[in-house]
Amino acid sequence: EPPTACREKQYLINSQCCSLCQPGQKLVSDCTEFTETECLPCGESEFLDTWNRETHCHQHKYCDPNLGLRVQQKGTSETDTICTCEEGWHCTSEACESCVLHRSCSPGFGVKQIATGVSDTICEPCPVGFFSNVSSAFEKCHPWTSCETKDLVVQQAGTNKTDVVCGPQDRLRA
């Protein structure tokens, strides 16, 4: 009686169970009553990562530098290439199929959290008493200079984009 289901790592074809090809190999011909399944290794830059009956191996993923990608781990006949972002770039999603440059925080904003390979820069507005006068992906908001500790007085108030300007105390005060 012909089988209706096959064991693990087998597949049903022409009323008989044939062995699947192991990872790293593709199917050349199905088994017969007299012959085993014929498999062939995947070629250079190709892979198959499961027990399979595929007649073509998959091409290794291309880590496109135009999308900010580089090779993190080179593929084998059994595994795909793993891509990651270039330094200074981050993934557009968890799957990391493309990358974009980290955002810079504009003047008046400081870096709350430095970007990683999977998350962008997080900026925050500089609160009163702090400033940032540069566009940067690294710089936090800096505190205004304390004129008093230098025995000076504030001559020009600070903003979220500028530091205070200190000057000498007016010695002519009554």
């Epitope: 091409q59 993923k61 557009t92 999603s93 799957a95 199929e97 493309s98 974009v100």
Partner: antibody
Framework: EVTVKESGPVLVKPTETLTLTCTVS????????VSWIRQPPGKALEWLGG???????YYASWAKSRLTISRDTNLKQVVLTMTNMDPVDTATYYC??????????WGQGTLVTVSS | AFQLTQSPSSLSASVGDRVTITCQAS??????LAWYQQKPGKPPKLLIV???NLASGVPSRFSGSGSGTDFTLTISSLQPEDFATYYC??????????FGGGTKVEIK
């Protein structure tokens, strides 16, 4: 050869649910995501959503409540389900290789008409 | 919600003309922008990735520029096969994956 191909009904009645299938070959769904994009006749492309190579699904904010995107890596298929279809949903529906990325590989598209 | 505004929506030009199409994002998307060309009855064809990098097999008369919120596609010398509709697409994140409204390039 790397291909993606859409299949499903060409005619859907208003209020019905649309189910479209994207069948891929030449690449693994564990390595690449697949997105769905539609184009109403004579109008612009609209990104509906996609599924990443890690299985994460993403949806356009305006379509989130009506869409489900799922996949079967063994069957090499990605399925789009869109509920409560309306005549304004009449469009050519494309699947393309890639999740949140650019789309270098597109299917030929399938025209879905919503009419009673 | 995030938007991509493409302009003009259509333009008429002659073979040999220099053509410029712009795309403006409602918030910064770094250089996460692509450009496509679409001809009637066909799926779009990828032209530019990363705002300025030519996709494989695309003629060098096409170029892209911009970063942040403002982007441009330029065709330096329009050829007969370039009459088509062009779309920009952002891919900075899942919440900002959107296509522009398209620009139809017609024969003058």
């Amino acid at each position: 050869e790397v291909t993606v191909k859409e299949s499903g009904p060409v005619l859907v009645k208003p209020t019905e649910t649309l189910t479209l299938t994207c069948t891929v070959s030449g690449f693994s769904l564990s390595s690449y995501g697949v997105s769905w994009i539609r184009q109403p006749p004579g109008k612009a492309l609209e990104w509906l959503g996609g599924i990443g190579s890690d299985g994460s699904a993403y949806y356009a904010s305006w379509a989130k409540s009506r869409l489900t995107i799922s996949r079967d890596t063994n069957l090499k298929q990605v399925v789009l389900t869109m509920t409560n279809m309306d005549p304004v949903d009449t469009a050519t529906y494309y699947c393309a290789r890639g999740g949140i990325t650019v789309y270098a590989m597109w299917g030929q598209g399938t025209l879905v008409t919503v009419s009673s | 919600a995030f938007q991509l505004t493409q302009s003009p929506s259509s333009l008429s030009a002659s073979v040999g003309d220099r053509v410029t199409i712009t795309c403006q994002a409602s918030q910064s998307i770094s250089q996460g922008l692509a450009w496509y060309q679409q001809k009637p009855g066909k799926p779009p064809k990828l032209l530019i990735v990363g705002a300025s990098n030519l996709a494989s097999g695309v003629p060098s008369r096409f170029s892209g520029s911009g970063s942040g919120t403002d982007f441009t596609l330029t065709i330096s010398s329009l050829q007969p096969e370039d009459f088509a509709t062009y779309y920009c697409q952002s891919y900075f994140s899942s919440s900002s994956t959107v296509f522009g409204g398209g620009t139809k390039v017609e024969i003058k």
